[in-house]
């Protein structure tokens, strides 16, 4: 099995997480891609996905998440703007390839969002927090629902409330197309 690796990002409320997930260009360029959160003891939960087929450089926005799939570069860009403490968690990019199970892209992202000043080495205690606000949702792609025999034995997620972002303009609990896909071993 491939060793799962993580990159940790420590950010403050109001900042932007801006990451890329590389993929094999020839194989996955037009495949639908998704951004998921993995919470302890739960199955990955899809927060946003590209259109199907995925369009080149066409931004898809779900709440504070913006996905851009650059086919010609072989990368999916993920931005989470106006971060909230509640956004902290482990994230991953996946590629949908029905009827097979989604293909996970490396590396996973460990996001830690802190209120005010993070106090971590290398951070600036006197820097001001960004107060940038994004416009309301512009485009939302429907994410497919996958079922798998492997999910049967797993306990269902405790609640969807834990992805809520009460202080943001758009609450992720309002997104009706959040889906669950198998845990990757």
């Amino acid at each position: 099995a491939t060793k799962l690796t993580e990159e940790k990002y420590e950010l403050k409320e109001g900042q932007t997480l801006d990451v890329k997930c590389d993929y094999t260009l020839e194989k996955f360029a037009s495949s639908q891609k998704a951004w998921q959160i993995i919470r302890d003891g739960e199955m990955p939960k899809t927060l946003a996905c590209t259109e199907r087929p995925s369009k080149n450089s066409h931004p898809v926005q779900v709440g504070r998440i913006i996905l851009e799939d650059y086919h010609d570069h072989g990368l999916l860009r993920v931005r989470m703007v106006n971060l909230q403490v509640e956004d902290s968690g482990l994230y991953q990019c996946v590629i949908y390839q029905p009827p097979k199970e989604p293909h996970m892209l490396f590396d996973r992202i460990r996001l830690v969002v802190t209120k005010g000043f993070s106090g971590t080495p290398g951070s600036n205690e006197n820097s001001t927090q960004n107060v940038y606000k994004i416009p309301p949702t512009t485009t939302k792609a429907l994410c497919p629902l996958y079922t798998s025999p492997r999910t049967v034995t797993q306990a269902p997620p405790k609640s969807t409330a834990d992805v809520s972002t009460p202080d943001s303009e758009i609450n992720l609990t309002n997104v009706t197309d959040i889906i669950r896909v198998p845990v990757f071993n």
Partner: antibody
Framework: QVQLVQSGAEVKKPGASVKVSCKAS????????IHWVRQAPGQGLEWMGW????????NYAQKFQGRVTMTRDTSISTAYMELSRLRSDDTAVYYC??????????????WGQGTLVTVSS | SYELTQPPSVSVSPGQTASITCSGD??????VAWYQQKPGQSPVLVIY???KRPSGIPERFSGSKSGNTATLTISGTQAMDEADYYC????????FGGGTKLTVL
């Protein structure tokens, strides 16, 4: 420690091509994008494009499309930038730089020492 | 194409605070990095992710962002801080600001 060592200065005639190398050490070469940035005398930094050493895929700034080619030789952890149809205004210091992390495109934490390319007839 | 705008020059007296701005469309959605470049040398990363300092960068360097404007602040400016400073962001492509020459009087 991470190091990017570039090839030496070059003098070229207009219309010719130049190929600059950037040898990486101290990290897994395939894991991080390599960028090329140039700086004309007395001017600012100008991003030319990036190379994904893992796939060999590259992304070029619009200005250089059709004239620049970025490649790599993973066996010797070296990236290359070739610029063709040189003009006098291509005279500049050319830098290679490496992403800070595997999952980001910016910032560039490590830079080569620069290669001066002079285009003169 | 995406552009980042910086003032061409900023002057400051030793020990005073220097502020260099960088503005661009939707910069609030993007992470900003700052580089210092001294004559004849390669650029050095001094701030990333809007306000973080790489190890080895003095505490007098700080970064902030409000709306679509990022600011590099150098408090207690020293003669050795005289250099060119560039902001950077990632739009569809990577973009650098035009650069700001910091002069320590």
């Amino acid at each position: 420690q991470v190091q990017l060592v570039q090839s030496g200065a070059e003098v070229k005639k207009p219309g010719a091509s130049v190929k600059v190398s950037c040898k990486a050490s101290g990290y897994t070469f395939n894991g991080y994008y390599i960028h090329w940035v140039r700086q004309a005398p007395g001017q600012g930094l100008e991003w030319m494009g990036w190379l994904n050493p893992n796939s060999g895929g590259a992304n070029y700034a619009q200005k250089f499309q059709g004239r620049v080619t970025m490649t790599r030789d993973t066996s010797i952890s070296t990236a290359y930038m070739e610029l063709s149809r040189l003009r006098s205004d291509d005279t500049a210091v050319y830098y290679c730089a490496r992403d800070q992390r595997k999952t980001t495109v910016t910032p560039f934490e490590y830079w080569g020492q620069g290669t001066l390319v002079t285009v003169s007839s | 194409s995406y552009e980042l705008t910086q003032p061409p020059s900023v002057s400051v007296s030793p020990g005073q605070t220097a502020s260099i701005t960088c503005s661009g469309d939707k910069l609030g959605e993007r992470n900003v990095a700052w580089y210092q470049q001294k004559p004849g040398q390669s650029p050095v990363l001094v701030i990333y992710q809007d306000n973080k300092r790489p190890s080895g960068i003095p505490e007098r360097f700080s970064g902030s962002k409000s709306g679509n404007t990022a600011t590099l602040t150098i408090s207690g400016t020293q003669a050795m801080d005289e250099a060119d400073y560039y902001c950077q962001a990632w739009d569809r492509n990577v973009v650098f600001g035009g650069g700001t020459k910091l002069t320590v009087l």
